[in-house]
Structures are given as structure tokens and as C-alpha cells.
Amino acid sequence: AMDLILINSLPLVSDAETSLTCIASGWRPHEPITIGRDFEALMNQHQDPLEVTQDVTREWAKKVVWKREKASKINGAYFCEGRVRGEAIRIRTMKMRQQASFLPATLTMTVDKGDNVNISFKKVLIKEEDAVIYKNGSFIHSVPRHEVPDILEVHLPHAQPQDAGVYSARYIGGNLFTSAFTRLIVRRCEAQKWGPECNHLCTACMNNGVCHEDTGECICPPGFMGRTCEKACELHTFGRTCKERCSGQEGCKSYVFCLPDPYGCSCATGWKGLQCNEACHPGFYGPDCKLRCSCNNGEMCDRFQGCLCSPGWQGLQCEREGIQRMTPKIVDLPDHIEVNSGKFNPICKASGWPLPTNEEMTLVKPDGTVLHPKDFNHTDHFSVAIFTIHRILPPDSGVWVCSVNTVAGMVEKPFNISVK
């Protein structure tokens, strides 16, 4: 139920207005969302406090806006944090000068433990100075002035979690404010593995979703949802249940989305580039346009959704025959329930295709505790999950959430419980 999203618009700072927006989508944080400077990633950045305001367009969102005259003070690393049930979710991002001497290939890069990694910086200004590379503000290497290549590369064979961090490049005569940054995220586990011992196999996350090493869940890119991120959202929407909407004239253009690690940052589906302001080339789709359409039967490729399958066909390439998937819907759930203290058996009922299974239906208490069904049954059209609370008490009053997450998508429905 915890869906925290940080929108960095625009990470390359010129003389235009730039902002960070942190959204708690579909849940109410127990403490206010915070946006701050990430001194763990970069120590020597500006100390000035940030002017954090409420984003009036959304219920639970905070925003920092820098006017064009403040551009010189923006460079650095930032975080957004939300808390629920004592658990903190922190999302990190960076901003840098568009006029920096080097520019990163990507804002963040997520790799698996043991991967062979290349972190690249493109030289955009030629200077008669040594180039220097840092990690988290710590010096790594200098490249003599006459040997600075067009692409400055850091190569990490067999990447380890301790290699994670913010890598930066600049000329020695420069400083933090002329540096280019890229953040390397190294999953604690090897490819396709998760769990404390990394011995569980990840669900195949589609559309560039990333398997969380602690939970095994797919973190879906902006524009996709569901247990395996197979389901495309409606146009210009994002979030775990696709409830949030990009308000720009061209949808999510110029929105860099940052999600909790190990996802990092990417453009919304349909966009690419460091500023997420370049449309995908024909035949490509998805976050950063990294996915290639290979649609069967000559089906159309949409840059936002991928292959648009004819009725009766499904799958990323429209390769499977079958009934078209239907996003789950929660039905027959009142907005408000009054109960007496004692035993309580709330029911969540959902439709959709395929029908939600026992594991795909959960109930989230106001304190963030996730409950799994005690009983479960289904008819031709509905799945019914019955939960058991042995002793419900007045402090349990508040907003409870019925949550359904299947391959066909995700839906959450909040409802109020008053306990007498």
C-alpha cells in the first residue's frame, strides 16, 4: 500500500524553473513527507534549507520549486522520504548543471550483484585540464589532460553492493557545481534472485520492472502495473494502480520518475533522454524507450503501451491466444463500516480476468500491517477473500485498504472502519 514517487523535473538545470515533487499515492503517510539534501551521497553540497511546500494539485504530495535565478545553487543529491508504521521509504535523485563539462549516460543505473558494469560520462566541453572521477565525493581517479576521452568510463567487473553510490566526473579546476552525476544501484542479490539469502527466484518482471531483493515484488516502471508489470496504464498515468496523472500538455514529457531502490529513475513509458523530453523512435516503447516491439500478426506498436493486441490475443508480443485480460475491480465494499469491539471478519470481493487468487488479495490496516485471507473462495465471476481479526479495538479505527494485485493490473479500495 506504500507507493512513494519522486518526480524530478528537470534533472539538468539550465536557466528555467526546476522542481522536485514527492507523491504518496494511494496511502496516507503517518508523518509528513520530507524532501531534503542527500548528504550521504554528496557531502559538500549547498547547506541552504529547502523551501518545501504542499503540492496543491494532489492530496499527499510535497514540492520544491527553484526559480530560474536560483539555478546555480541546485546542483547536488536529494531525497524524498515517507513513513508508515515506523518504516521509512527513501527515494534518491540528483540535479546537475546542463552546462556541466561532462554529462552522464543515465541518471541512475540498476544492476545485479556480480554484473559487469560500465558507467559512462560524455565529454561536452573540451578543456586543457585533468579530468577527475569521484564516488560519493571520494576521489577515484584522474585522467591526464591530454588523455581525456570523449566518453569517460568507469568499469566495474563483478559489481558488489559496496560499489553502489553517486559517481561524478568533472575537470580538476571545476567543483561540485560543474560535476556530472550518475547513481549506481547494485541489487543485493544476483540476477533474478531475492530474499535474505538470495535463494528465491524472482517473478519475471516485464516492461523493465525491477525485482525487489527483499520482497521479490516487481517495482513497475511509470506507465505499467500489476504483479508482473505486464499491464499498461491508461495514457499519461502512473503509480502502482495508475491513479496518478501527468498534468503536462504532452503528458509525462519532461518528468523524470524516481522510485524506491532498486528501481532508481527513468522516464515514463514513451519518453527517453536525460530530460525525458524525447519521444521513442518507431518500434520502441516503455521507460527510456528501452523496449522493442516485436508484435505478432502485424499488430500495431504504441510507444506508450507496446503491442496493441487484437481481441482474443494477449502477451507482450500478442503471442498468446486467450480471453483478454481484465484489470481487477473491487466490488460490494461499503465506504464506511461500523463494528463493535471483538472478532471481525471483513470481506474483499473482486472481479477481473484471470480471477484474483488467494495470494493476490490483501487487506491493509491503518497502521500499515498487511493481512492475508483466512478463507478464500471464487465463483465464475468473483473472488472472495475473508479475513479474520480476532480482536478489533477502537484504536483500529481508520482507513483500511482492500488491495488486489494480479497480472492484469492492480486496484486498491480504501474504506473506513469505526470500532465502538
Epitope: 585533468d130 577527475v132 572521477i133 569521484y134 565525493g137 571520494s138 576521489f139 577515484i140 581517479h141 584522474s142 585522467v143 591526464p144 588523455e147 568510463e153 568507469v154 568499469h155 566495474l156 567487473p157 563483478h158 558488489q160 560499489d163 580538476i172
Partner: antibody, heavy 124, light 107 residues
Framework: EVQLVESGGGLVQPGGSLRLSCAAS????????IHWVRQAPGKGLEWVAA????????YYADSVKGRFTISADTSKNTAYLQMNSLRAEDTAVYYC?????????????????WGQGTLVTVSS | DIQMTQSPSSLSASVGDRVTITCRAS??????VAWYQQKPGKAPKLLIY???FLYSGVPSRFSGSGSGTDFTLTISSLQPEDFATYYC?????????FGQGTKVEIK
């Protein structure tokens, strides 16, 4: 546990040769540079050479260039220092040390683990 | 080659004293300076890297500062196990070079 163990030191006559070995364990050999650093009796530290087992890149101090050759065998997780045309001034304790590999041309000189050293004495 | 000049070459101090060792580079080395501790008959141990970053497992009484050409290692409260020789080293360029060492002795 990270370990670097040097061997092969001893007494050799001027003009002679010696081959030092550095056996590495407890870490991914190809993800690090291996360095040789020496220390003459009662003196300070002097860097000698470095190799990346990952790509075979090598660097040498001017004082040993052309006489010493650093190499590595990734199948044995071992680095070597072949020392030819030895001189009296090469007498020292030779340490092997490691540093994180960040790329072929990005030699990183912060050495976080060191072996216990092996003594090389060049004397007639 | 870049020269690293350490001062003093030796010093006497008591347990609990604050000790400062300085190191000067012959040219700008950014923050590419490491500090090592060496005890007689033992291998050097890394204390500080990148001028001010404390290496893992090193007590917080050790700290480093500086950038460009001037660098400092400080031991805030000298402990019996800190009596040793300390070396600075530039990791900016090939060849890496060490200072001549500072021997910290018991007063």
C-alpha cells in the same frame, strides 16, 4: 576473509633474478588491482608496480621499468613480480597490496589490504 | 613525479594528546590523499582515503582534511596502540608517491 600472502623472497647476488608471488584469497581477484610496494630497511614506502588481473593493464615506477615485470594468473588468483638485473638498492621488504578496479585506464591507488611482506636482499 | 613532504618527521606525545601531522604535495592533487599507519615489522594499514574519508573499522579519533596541496591527519586523543609511523600517499596519478613518514613516539 581477505588475505594476501607473499613468497619468493631471499638472498640474491647483484645482477641476479628473483620471482615473487602474491597469493590472493577471500575476494574476487579480477575486481582489484594488485600492487607491489617496497620498503628498504629503516626507510619509507615506495610503490613499484601494479597490474589489473581483469585486463592485464600494467604500470611501473621509473626505477624498475625494464627490469621488473608484473603478471597475474587469474586461474590461481596469484600475482607475480619477476625481478631481473637486481641491484643493491632493490634490497627491501616487498609487500603486495590490492585496490578496487574501476577500469583499464582508471588505476586506483588507495590500497586497502596488504600482505605481511617478503624480504629481498641483494648482496654479494 | 609528485613529491609528498610530511612534517614533522617524528614527534613525542602522551596518551590523550591531540596529534596533528601535515603533508604537502608538490602540485594540486585534488582530494586524492590517503593515510596509512605502520607498526614495526608489520604491513601498513589504511586509515583515511580521499583526504577525509575514514576507512571502515578505523576508530573515529582519526580524521583527515585538506584538498589541493595541503593535507592533515589528526588523532584527537592518542591511545597506546596509536604509537606507530604514519605515511601520507597521493593517489592522484602514476606513480603514486608516499611521504617520508612521521614517527609518533611515547613521551
Amino acid at each position: 576473509e581477505v588475505q594476501l600472502v607473499e613468497s619468493g623472497g631471499g638472498l640474491v647476488q647483484p645482477g641476479g633474478s628473483l620471482r615473487l608471488s602474491c597469493a590472493a584469497s577471500g575476494f574476487t581477484f579480477s575486481s582489484y588491482w594488485i600492487h607491489w610496494v617496497r620498503q628498504a630497511p629503516g626507510k619509507g614506502l615506495e610503490w613499484v608496480a601494479a597490474i589489473s588481473p581483469n585486463d592485464g593493464s600494467t604500470y611501473y615506477a621509473d626505477s624498475v621499468k625494464g627490469r621488473f615485470t608484473i603478471s597475474a594468473d587469474t586461474s590461481k588468483n596469484t600475482a607475480y613480480l619477476q625481478m631481473n638485473s637486481l641491484r643493491a638498492e632493490d634490497t627491501a621488504v616487498y609487500y603486495c597490496a590490492r585496490s578496487r578496479y574501476y577500469g583499464q585506464r582508471l588505476v586506483y591507488y588507495v590500497m586497502d589490504y596488504w600482505g605481511q611482506g617478503t624480504l629481498v636482499t641483494v648482496s654479494s | 613525479d609528485i613529491q609528498m613532504t610530511q612534517s614533522p618527521s617524528s614527534l613525542s606525545a602522551s596518551v590523550g594528546d591531540r596529534v596533528t601531522i601535515t603533508c604537502r604535495a608538490s602540485q594540486d592533487v585534488s582530494t586524492a590523499v590517503a593515510w596509512y599507519q605502520q607498526k614495526p615489522g608489520k604491513a601498513p594499514k589504511l586509515l583515511i582515503y580521499s583526504a577525509s574519508f575514514l576507512y571502515s573499522g578505523v576508530p573515529s579519533r582519526f580524521s583527515g582534511s585538506g584538498s589541493g596541496t595541503d593535507f592533515t591527519l589528526t588523532i584527537s586523543s592518542l591511545q597506546p596502540e596509536d604509537f606507530a609511523t604514519y605515511y601520507c600517499q597521493q593517489s592522484y596519478t602514476t606513480p603514486p608517491t608516499f611521504g617520508q613518514g612521521t614517527k609518533v613516539e611515547i613521551k
